[in-house]
């Protein structure tokens, strides 16, 4: 098992996932492609928690780049042991992975709350409110109730799709960071087993 290659693989995956999280979160600000609702503050409160931009996005880039950097061979040895520095790096990646766990966890929690509460929309009685808040998430299973939202157009589908994407992406990020915690601990304790000659695919 090459712990460095595995970490690099996780790092590259996290960069992609973080960018997707940022895109999904940004799209939540423009229901039906309109800017009017953001400027009028007619967006779900959970959109303003920046869970995809900060939690699943920017905060995820820190561990991602740490993991990518682990496979480089210019790590200094210590006490005459070349692998010592790499071991320290692997163990320090655990700390970066924990930051990633916190970020992705935040993303998952906010996305789940956003899904459960439903969107802020103009209901059929001309009121801007959280139309589905009292259904405790049951509206997700009963699409016939989605007609209660008359504005923004397709807001329920928009919110459900994007918060579901954030939930899934955050969940994957969480699992990958958890894997890196295990990988980092094993790599730090068992040693950096990769020689320059060993080649592993992601």
């Amino acid at each position: 098992m090459c712990y460095g290659k595995c970490a690099r693989c996780i790092g590259h995956s996290l960069v992609g996932l973080a960018l997707l999280c940022i895109i999904a979160n940004i799209l939540l600000y423009f229901p039906n492609g309109e800017t009017k609702y953001a400027s009028e503050n007619h967006l779900s409160r959970f959109v303003w928690f920046f869970s995809g931009i900060v939690g699943g996005g920017l905060l995820m880039l820190l561990p991602a780049f740490v993991f990518i950097g682990l496979e480089q061979d210019d790590c200094c040895g210590c006490c005459g042991h070349e692998n010592c520095g790499k071991r320290c790096a692997m163990l320090s990646s655990v700390l970066a992975a924990l930051i990633g766990i916190a970020g992705s966890g935040y993303c998952v929690i906010v996305a789940a709350l956003g899904l459960a509460e439903g969107p802020l929309c103009l209901d059929s009685f001309g009121q801007w409110n959280y139309t589905f808040a009292s259904t405790e998430g049951q509206y997700l299973l009963d699409t016939s109730t989605w007609s209660q939202c008359t504005e923004p157009k397709h807001i329920v589908e928009w919110n459900v799709s994007l918060f579901s994407i954030l939930l899934a992406l955050g969940g994957i990020e969480f699992i990958l960071c958890l894997i890196q915690v295990i990988n980092g601990v094993l790599g730090g304790i068992c040693g950096f087993c990769c020689s320059r000659q060993q080649q592993y695919d992601c």
């Epitope: 103009l122 209901d123 009685f125 001309g126 009121q127 109730t145 209660q148 504005e151 923004p152 157009k153």
Partner: antibody, heavy 116, light 107 residues
């Protein structure tokens, strides 16, 4: 003061179509929803559907699909309901009602009589 | 479609006394219920939505309550202008069906 002015009474022949209008005036809210309701003489209320004139989102009672078509003109603040293939069962008073900001305003109603 | 059943179909009460009208839904509609008042030959008036939120301009002697399938409209002190027919309407999913109405007469 908000007012909903509905078009006058209509006497139409069976099989014909009729287009009812509902003009809103005195509005302070930009987002509102216009509903249409049917009431046969001496009977209860029946929900036909609604239209949001800003988003053009419409929703119609399945019972009135193919019977009622809801449209609106933002520039003139007027909502329309076209009723097609009229029969004696369609003889009723049709109300438009506008909801916005916790208030609701109703038109005076349009009496549609279907008779040969 | 969700069926809305109102009771009683008609009632007579004296000015100053409290009145309660009930409405039952055929399935769980949470708190998605509205109440209307219609006087003879007039357009309906919107009273309550979301089961308990009073619409603008509605006097505070009226109040709505209930959830799931059982709802009620209460008038704590009956006034002469309260006579007419009261309708409940669910707004949970389409079609937004109305109850059959409760005709309130003044004794």
């Amino acid at each position: 003061e908000v007012q909903l002015q509905q078009s006058g009474p209509e006497l139409v022949k069976p099989g014909a179509s009729v287009k009812l209008s509902c003009k809103a005036s005195g509005y302070t809210v930009t987002s509102y929803v216009m509903h249409w309701v049917k009431q046969k003489p001496g009977q209860g209320l029946e929900w036909i559907g609604y239209i949001n004139p800003y988003s053009d989102v419409t929703n119609c009672n399945e019972k009135f699909k193919g019977k009622a078509t809801l449209t609106s003109d933002k520039t003139s603040s007027t909502a329309y309901m076209e009723l097609s293939s009229l029969t004696s069962e369609d003889s009723a008073v049709y109300y438009c009602s506008s909801y916005g900001g916790g208030f609701a305003y109703w038109g005076q109603g349009t009496l549609v009589t279907v008779s040969a | 479609d969700i069926q809305m059943t109102q009771s009683p179909a008609s009632l007579s009460a004296s000015v100053g006394e409290p009145v309660t009208i009930t409405c039952r839904a055929s399935k769980n509609i949470y708190t998605y219920l509205a109440w209307y008042h219609q006087k003879q030959g007039k357009s309906p008036q919107f009273l309550v939505y979301n089961a308990r939120t009073l619409a603008g301009g509605v006097p505070s002697r009226l109040s709505g309550s209930g959830s799931v399938t059982q709802f009620s409209l209460n008038i704590n002190t009956l006034h002469r202008e309260d006579l007419g027919t009261y309708f409940c309407q669910h707004h949970y999913d389409t079609p937004y069906t109305f109850g059959g109405g409760t005709n309130l007469e003044i004794k």
